[in-house]
């Protein structure tokens, strides 16, 4: 299920006075599109331009991250008079043009979404016939990818003074809440580290001192689901054996 945020309370602009007789360059994209990891999403983009009845060669491009300079994730080219835009680039084969650029529509479908796809995308069109012109969305559409929690790492590590600590790292969007349970613990939120810059979907919780042998379980939960993983601590002759 894909949700498109068409309006935002931060938008101060609302009243059209009257329509203009001539078209100018502009691109219309929603501020945000939301979809779940594993699903597909459609990034809408339509445009207007000042070159009436342009029928020459054109190129449609989508970038990720930043306008003008961000890496291209999709590119296709249409020959003069053709409505077929031949794909020249589709990153990992997951990007497909849904719209018809000849009809001012650059809408893109993204398949098999992953959390790493959560970023801004910018559409661009280039004319290269009798007219040489191009335009790119400055503001882009934010693709918000949601995902149920997944524990990506759970481990026991040595600490100073022959002690042990446990680490649990999970990913998800919204970022999951982590809780530890285990011998003499009950349920403990432990020390949860905030998502790190550049790792916005990862959350780590540390259990700083494991005082008893036994099974320690990390639970990650968000609005989309929950996930658990366990680690076992057995101390013999001052050493540790751990399995998950």
């Amino acid at each position: 299920f894909v949700r498109t945020k068409i309006d935002t309370t931060e938008n101060l602009l609302n009243t059209e006075v009257h329509s203009s007789p001539a078209q100018r360059w502009s691109m219309q994209v929603p501020p945000e599109v939301s979809a779940e990891a594993g699903d597909a999403a459609v990034l809408p983009c339509t445009f207007t331009h000042p070159h009436r009845h342009y029928d020459g060669p054109l190129t449609a491009i989508w970038r990720a991250g930043e306008p003008y300079a961000g890496p291209q994730v999709f590119r296709c080219a249409a020959a003069r008079g053709s409505e077929l835009c031949q794909t020249a680039l589709s990153l990992h084969g997951r990007f497909r043009l849904l719209g018809n650029p000849r009809r001012n529509d650059l809408s893109l479908r993204v398949e098999r979404l992953a959390l790493a796809d959560d970023r801004r995308y910018f559409c661009r069109v280039e004319f290269a016939g009798d007219v040489h012109d191009r335009y790119e969305s400055r503001h882009g559409v934010r693709l918000h990818v949601t995902a149920a929690p997944r524990i990506v790492n759970i481990s026991v590590l040595p600490s100073p003074a022959h002690a042990f600590r446990a680490l649990c790292t999970a990913e998800g969007e919204p970022p999951p809440a982590l809780a530890w349970s285990g011998p003499a613990l009950g349920n403990s939120l432990a020390a949860v580290r905030s998502p790190r810059e550049g790792h916005g979907h990862l959350v780590t919780a540390e259990l700083p001192a494991l005082t008893h042998d036994g099974r320690y379980t990390c639970t990650a939960a968000n609005s989309l689901g929950r996930s658990e993983a366990s680690v076992y601590l057995f101390r013999f002759h001052g050493a540790s054996g751990a399995s998950t």
């Epitope: 938008n11 100018r24 360059w25 502009s26 501020p31 000042p50 300079a69 790119e136």
Partner: antibody, heavy 118, light 107 residues
């Protein structure tokens, strides 16, 4: 409410440096391009610089290129303008403004005065 | 360089219609916006995308763009509309330009 507040202006000698700040509130700062615009005494508005959401993309007017640096700290909701090698002709009120989605400036700060004089 | 040209001044009697023009090649391809600035105050957006009005701006403000000339029209001009008005336009990427400004005097 949506608000931008500039600070950091003052009197500086030619060749000197100054750093302007613009504190944003009432909106999701990281969702918007931001800009600096200046106005010399008795003159018109002059666009100075743009910065994209993340700060990775920046643009400058020719008159300040190589001397001014725009930056932002999204965690602090703050926009900056580092001005080096200042000249008398840089004397102006400096405004920060938010760029709306239709490529115009829909929210402005009250401005901060920079005077370059010996 | 991109340039937008405005008349330095326009005068209008109260209740009459004021028209302020702005011309430049960029306006053939890109939208115009208009800003009102009163003495000692920051500019305020009054028109964007040639003819759209932000919320809170009175209906007497309207805009149009034909060929390479954008026009700001103030119908039934009031004394409080006396101000400097600047047209502006983006171009494809990094360029942004303001017109030289027009001082509107309400007689």
């Amino acid at each position: 409410q949506v608000q931008l507040v500039e600070s950091g202006g003052g009197l500086v000698q030619p060749g000197g440096s100054l750093r302007l700040s613009c504190a944003a509130s009432g909106f999701t700062f990281s969702n918007y391009w931001m800009t600096w615009v200046r106005q010399a005494p008795g003159k018109g508005l002059e666009w100075v610089s743009f910065i994209s959401y993340s700060g990775s993309t920046t643009y400058y007017a020719d008159s300040v290129k190589g001397r001014f640096t725009i930056s932002r700290d999204n965690s602090k909701n703050t926009l900056y303008l580092q001005m080096n090698s200042l000249r008398a002709e840089d004397t102006a009120v400096y405004y920060c403004a938010r760029e709306g989605t239709s490529s115009m400036f829909d929210v402005w700060g009250q401005g901060t005065l920079v005077t370059v004089s010996s | 360089d991109i340039e937008l040209t405005q008349p330095p001044s326009v005068s209008v009697a109260p209740g009459q219609t004021a028209r302020i023009s702005c011309s430049g090649d960029a306006l053939r391809s890109y939208y115009a916006s208009w800003y009102q600035q009163k003495p000692g105050q920051a500019p305020v957006l009054v028109i964007y995308d040639d003819n759209k009005r932000p919320s809170g701006i009175p209906e007497r403000f309207s805009g149009s763009n034909s060929g390479n000339t954008a026009t700001l029209t103030i119908s039934g001009t009031q004394a409080e509309d006396e101000a400097d008005y600047y047209c502006a336009s983006f171009t494809y990427m990094s360029d942004f330009v303001f017109g030289g400004g027009t001082k509107l005097t309400v007689l």
